[in-house]
Every structure is written in structure tokens, then in C-alpha cells.
């Protein structure tokens, strides 16, 4: 039975040209996290594996940095980076947990972080 929940940074906004940290946190389970995949809509951005460490997709290497922790840092943001991001936690023995973050990249200098929320 899957008892865990994913807490994410929720809906967030950031300035064009700036950077942002995408963070998810798995709680309420003793399951072992074996791997976390980060996806942007239908593109694999990065993977953090418990044994192998980080793999950043080559097409994103210039603008994506691993961490902090199991999170992901997006740099040199453009308006095309606006959209949904998913953290996919592969765990044992529970299985897979998925969290969603919506990022809006703004032209202006007014970019506020949204509230944190949970996805069961």
C-alpha cells in the first residue's frame, strides 16, 4: 500500500534570464527512493539514481544543474520554459510517486513563489 505523499514547490514564477530551483519531497513513507526522474511535459530533463548519481539529458546540460538534493536547478530561463514539470520518485517497495510543479517565466521583474501544496 502506497502511503507516501509528494510535497512540491507548487505553482512558481521566475524572471526571464534568471534561475529557479524545482524541489519535491517524499514524506509519510519508509520506502527507499531508488531514483528520481525529472520531466518537462514530454521531455526527460534529468535523472538522479541512488547508485549511479545524476544524469542530465545532453540537450539540457547547459541550462540544468543537479540539486540541491534531489531537486533540479533551471538556469537562463526563457519564456519557453513555462509549463509543467514532474518529479517522478521510484521507490521500493511502494512503487512510483509523481509530483507536479507549474513554472511561469515572466518578462517583468515581479516573480513571486506560489504556495506549497501536496499531491497524494
Amino acid at each position: 500500500m502506497m502511503t507516501g505523499t509528494i510535497e512540491t514547490t507548487g505553482n512558481i514564477s521566475a524572471e526571464k534570464g534568471g534561475s529557479i530551483i524545482l524541489q519535491c519531497h517524499l514524506s509519510s513513507t519508509t520506502a527507499q527512493v531508488t531514483q528520481v526522474n525529472w520531466e518537462q511535459q514530454d521531455q526527460l530533463l534529468a535523472i538522479c539514481n541512488a547508485d549511479l548519481g545524476w544524469h542530465i539529458s545532453p540537450s539540457f546540460k547547459d541550462r540544468v544543474a543537479p540539486g540541491p538534493g534531489l531537486g533540479l536547478t533551471l538556469q537562463s530561463l526563457t519564456v519557453n520554459d513555462t509549463g509543467e514539470y514532474f518529479c517522478i520518485y521510484h521507490t521500493y517497495p511502494d512503487g512510483t510517486y509523481t509530483g507536479r510543479i507549474f513554472l511561469e517565466v515572466l518578462e517583468s521583474s515581479v516573480a513571486e513563489h506560489g504556495a506549497r501544496f501536496q499531491i497524494p
Epitope: 514530454d42 547508485d51 549511479l52 540537450s59 521510484h90
Partner: antibody, heavy 118, light 107 residues
Framework: EVQLLESGGGLVQPGGSLRLSCAAS????????MHWVRQAPGKGLEWVAS????????YYADSVKGRFTISRDNSKNTLYLQMNSLRAEDTAVYYC???????????WGQGTLVTVSS | DIQMTQSPSSLSASVGDRVTITCRAS??????LNWYQQKPGKAPKLLIY???SLQSGVPSRFSGSGSGTDFTLTISSLQPEDFATYYC?????????FGGGTKVEIK
């Protein structure tokens, strides 16, 4: 240099058993998921089974479930496939392959031929 | 199970030609799509992983694109050593499944 070397193939009668081995070298075997993929003569590739780095999870194709068992010995850097109740349709070249991040298969062995025939 | 449909099943081309092979998944697989090359009597060789990432050591004339359900492998200028069979494979979910293969032959 990454190397995967399969062995244990051969001719076996229907209903018989065979154990394939895959000896790995040139990388930290215990950190990688591993897979068995087969190819019947003149046919395409068919995934057979996979096992996580720590043996925590094992997955099988429906066509072999209950008959084949995948296992590994990380102290010996070796992957195994125990094949029971073999059928003519199991005749194929069996490849072991390394599966980093459970997303792609980046290194393959040369394959070992299993022939099931009376 | 996710079905992978490759087309064409075979094609004839000349050295220097631009060759395109397509692969369609029966449901969305994000970018969990890999391409392999296989020559007779040899093991498959990884060319492209995660839809568009070129595997180390693979010539840059090979490229991959697509996401969701539709994917493409392109060989920009076919070389003599490229005549082989090409397979797509999804790793979105188990069972892992392969396309039926595309045999690239000399015209």
C-alpha cells in the same frame, strides 16, 4: 572497457531446463539494472526479464512468467537466467544487456543460442 | 502492454541519402524511446536514448526526435556501414517493448 559475456546456451528438449550466465566486467556491476533480451532466428528483439541493481525488483515478459527466473550475484559480477519448462518458441539468441537508469540498454553481450527441439 | 509500430519495415537507399525511420507508440511514452542498430550476427548497439540523446561514440549523422507517441530516427547522410536493421524500444513501462525493426538495404 565494459564487457558482457553470456554462456550456458545449447540444445535442450521441450520441457527441459537451462541456466544462462552473463559475466560482467569493466564497470561496477552492483550499481546497474540488468536485462535479458532474446531474438528468435530471423525475427526481431523481445525483452525477456530485468532485475534492479539490488535484486529488489524483478520483471518478466508474460511469455516467460512462471517459467524463467532472473537473478544476480553482485559478489561474482554475474547475471543469471534460469529457464524451466522450455518450449520450441523459446528458441532464440539470448542477450544480456546493461540498463543504466532503467531507461536505455547501453551495452550488450554477444549472445548465446538456445535451441529447444526434440 | 505498449505496442511499438515501426515504419517502413524495410527500405532501399544509396550512400549519401537522407534516411528517416518512424516509430509510433500505442500510448504516450514521454521521451522514453531508444534506437538501436543491429548488423547480421551481431548484438544490437545503442544509437539514441531518451528520444534525442546521442550515445557516446555514435556518429553525429544519427539523430532522434519526437515525444509522446511519435518518434523519428534520421540518418543525415547514409554511409556504407549504416546498412543494418534499426529497432526502436520504449522504456516507459514494463514490459519493455521493441518495434518490429526497419531493414536498411543498399539500392
Amino acid at each position: 572497457e565494459v564487457q558482457l559475456l553470456e554462456s550456458g546456451g545449447g540444445l535442450v528438449q521441450p520441457g527441459g531446463s537451462l541456466r544462462l550466465s552473463c559475466a560482467a566486467s569493466g564497470f561496477t556491476f552492483s550499481s546497474y539494472g540488468m536485462h535479458w533480451v532474446r531474438q528468435a532466428p530471423g525475427k526481431g528483439l523481445e525483452w525477456v526479464a530485468s532485475i534492479k541493481s539490488s535484486s529488489s525488483n524483478k520483471y518478466y515478459a508474460d511469455s516467460v512468467k512462471g517459467r524463467f527466473t532472473i537473478s544476480r550475484d553482485n559478489s561474482k559480477n554475474t547475471l543469471y537466467l534460469q529457464m524451466n519448462s522450455l518450449r520450441a518458441e523459446d528458441t532464440a539468441v539470448y542477450y544480456c544487456a546493461r540498463g543504466p537508469y532503467d531507461v536505455w540498454l547501453d551495452y550488450w553481450g554477444q549472445g548465446t543460442l538456445v535451441t529447444v527441439s526434440s | 502492454d505498449i505496442q511499438m509500430t515501426q515504419s517502413p519495415s524495410s527500405l532501399s537507399a544509396s550512400v549519401g541519402d537522407r534516411v528517416t525511420i518512424t516509430c509510433r507508440a500505442s500510448q504516450s511514452i514521454s521521451s522514453y524511446l531508444n534506437w538501436y542498430q543491429q548488423k547480421p550476427g551481431k548484438a544490437p548497439k545503442l544509437l539514441i536514448y531518451a528520444a534525442s540523446s546521442l550515445q557516446s561514440g555514435v556518429p553525429s549523422r544519427f539523430s532522434g526526435s519526437g515525444s509522446g507517441t511519435d518518434f523519428t530516427l534520421t540518418i543525415s547522410s547514409l554511409q556504407p556501414e549504416d546498412f543494418a536493421t534499426y529497432y526502436c524500444q520504449q522504456s516507459y513501462s514494463t514490459p519493455l517493448t521493441f518495434g518490429g525493426g526497419t531493414k536498411v538495404e543498399i539500392k
